[in-house]
């Protein structure tokens, strides 16, 4: 009778994440009697997975059933596989023994090679906003892919950039890998509906890459211009003067009119009308009863936009010389939230 | 302890079936194999057969042509069919229990529990 | 086909050590069972996997086998432990008895 071999046919074994992996093992014997037990690993530092004689090994199936006395089947199955299950399992043939079995025979061994899915990239943008001309970075991460393999880009509003850097986690062998990559944006005045997108590509997506996306809208600030201008006289005596704010971003904006330096009026910007690139516009206007100033009036609309140093644009309003008429000194009626009569 | 009683016809004549059944008291029946075992008068034990739950037989290749053994695990017996029977079939017959439990596999369980025999006689 | 021989007898003195053996071709790569059967009544397990006891059977019964040779050793033995001893093993699939042993205690 020859002497019993064990046969593993299986050199190596690619499974899905999730999916149960068979391990296959056959005997060429039943002689000499004595259990089989399944290993990961080599050497004294081996991992037990399946011990036929005793234990309890909830994700372990036998294809076979064991108990059937011609029995030489002792091929497994491995259910819900991590990347961690990652290795080369060896079919080992034991001989009893007294006390304990000896181990008699091993397979040349199935290495294990586990397919995972990259994590959904996630995109971070700056901590802060950037204006229009500055360049800003944005990181991309995705996690517990395998094998090592994978391919990432990047794009702005459909079109691939160039600018960044990628590196992949750890350099050596592991049973999952991390990626991250680096990209530089330029911003422009017209990126607010703009998009970064990080696309990752890997062999267990079929072709369908994961994308993570980053809106500008978050990283963007467009600071307002100003534009103060004097309107055609409303009524006798009454001036309207209006401070235009265009094109900014985000809508955090509050105004303020001075008059000769001194504080008349403060408001916060609500009723905005929005630009087709998703900036914004605004105006506050100002009624002044020039009746009331001997000299010129010196008219300030001062922005302060998304907490930045406040913006100013101011406007000279010439008054003509006039008799001082009997009671313009008092007090004349507010006629709008965005009116004021000055004295 | 699993216990087992058997019974069946003690008197046959040559060319009829044998058949014999075997009840199963106590234990688990789908952790055994269920044996059966013959004894000619003055001679030593041979084995026949032995069948689990699930049906899975295996025979006395000597025998194999001329024996069933089949299982009732809703009644928990299992019987033994042996046809054309000769006065050589002439013995006791035991049915016994081989337990294969936890730490069990191929080879490392035998007969733990045997029945109390049955005498099965042959003649014409 | 596998084939297991016993010595048709054994004789030993009361409290002696009585020792029955069998034999098979490497024998002792397999499990060896025995079995003790006395006059009238059905055979009874006491040893099984070459050297372990059931439950119940004394101490004085062990077992060994190795190469082509299983021994089951009887210490101390007693007039009770008179009676026909069988070894077993199996062979694909298949149980193989030896002829048995009749031990006598004189």
């Known amino acids: 009778e020859e002497e019993l071999q064990v046969i593993q046919p299986d050199k190596s074994v690619l499974v899905a994440a999730g999916e149960t992996a068979t391990l296959r093992c056959t005997a060429t014997s039943l002689i000499p009697v004595g259990p089989i037990q399944w290993f990961r690993g080599a050497g004294p530092g081996r991992e037990l997975i399946y011990n036929q004689k005793e234990g309890h090994f909830p994700r372990v199936t036998t294809v076979s059933d064991l108990t059937k006395r011609n029995n030489m089947d002792f091929s497994i199955r491995i259910g819900n596989i991590t990347p961690a299950d990652a290795g080369t399992y060896y079919c080992v043939k034991f001989r009893k023994g007294s006390p304990d079995d000896v181990e008699f025979k091993s397979g040349a061994g199935t290495e294990l090679s586990v397919r995972a899915k990259p994590s959904a990239p996630v995109v971070s943008g700056p901590a802060a906003r950037a204006t229009p001309q500055h360049t800003v970075s944005f990181t991309c991460e995705s996690h517990g892919f395998s094998p090592r393999d994978i391919t990432l880009k990047w794009f702005k509003n459909g079109n691939e950039l160039s600018d960044f850097q990628t590196n992949v986690d750890p350099v050596g062998e592991s049973v999952s890998y991390s990626i991250h990559s680096t990209a530089k944006v330029v911003l422009t005045r017209e990126d607010v509906h703009s998009q970064v997108i990080c696309e990752v590509a890997h062999v267990t997506l079929q072709g369908d890459p994961l994308r993570g996306t980053a809106n500008l809208s978050e990283t963007i600030r467009v600071p307002p211009t100003l534009e103060v201008t004097q309107q055609p006289v409303r009524a006798e005596n009454q001036v309207n003067v209006t401070c235009q704010v265009r094109k900014f971003y985000p809508q955090r904006l509050q105004l303020t009119w001075l008059e000769n330096g001194n504080v008349s009026r403060t408001e916060t910007a609500s009723t905005v009308t929005e630009n087709k690139d998703g900036t914004y516009n605004w105006m506050s206007w100002l009624l002044v009863n020039v009746s009331a100033h001997r000299d010129d009036v010196k008219l300030t609309c001062q922005v302060e936009h998304d907490g930045q140093p406040a913006v100013s644009k101011s406007h000279d309003l010439k008054v003509s010389a006039h008799p001082k008429e009997q009671g313009s000194n008092t007090a004349a009626e507010n006629t709008g939230s965005n009116e004021r009569n000055i004295y | 302890q699993v216990q087992l009683q058997q019974w069946g016809a003690g008197l046959l004549k040559p060319s009829e079936t044998l058949s014999l059944t075997c009840a199963v008291y106590?234990?688990?029946?789908?952790?055994?194999?269920w044996n059966w075992i013959r004894q000619p008068p003055g001679k030593g034990l041979e084995w026949i057969g032995e069948?689990?739950?699930?049906?899975?037989?295996n025979y006395n290749p000597s025998l194999k042509s001329r024996v069933i053994i089949s299982v009732d695990t809703s009644k928990n017996q299992f019987s033994l069919k042996l046809s054309s029977v000769t006065a050589a079939d002439t013995a006791v017959y035991y049915c016994?229990?081989?337990?294969?439990?936890?730490?069990?596999?191929?080879?490392?369980?035998?007969?733990?529990?045997w029945g109390q025999g049955t005498t099965v006689t042959v003649s014409a | 086909s596998y084939e297991l021989t016993q010595s048709p007898s054994v004789s030993v003195s009361p409290g002696q050590t009585a020792s029955i053996t069998c034999s098979g071709d490497?024998?002792?790569?397999?499990y060896a069972w025995w079995y003790q059967q006395k006059p009238g009544q059905s055979p009874v397990l006491v040893i099984?996997?070459?050297?372990k006891r059931p439950s119940g059977i004394p101490e004085r019964f062990s077992g060994s086998n190795s190469g082509n040779t299983a021994t089951l050793t009887i210490s101390g033995t007693q007039a009770m432990d008179e009676a026909d001893y069988y070894c077993?093993?199996?062979?694909?699939?298949?149980?193989?008895f030896g002829g048995g042993t009749k031990l006598t205690v004189l």
């Open positions: 099984y996997q070459d050297d």
């Open positions: 069948i689990n739950h699930s049906g899975s037989t």
């Open positions: 016994a229990s081989s337990h294969y439990g936890s730490g069990s596999f191929p080879d490392s369980y035998g007969m733990d529990v």
């Open positions: 106590g234990g688990s029946f789908s952790t055994y194999y």
């Open positions: 490497k024998l002792g790569d397999r």
């Open positions: 077993q093993a199996w062979d694909s699939s298949t149980a193989v």
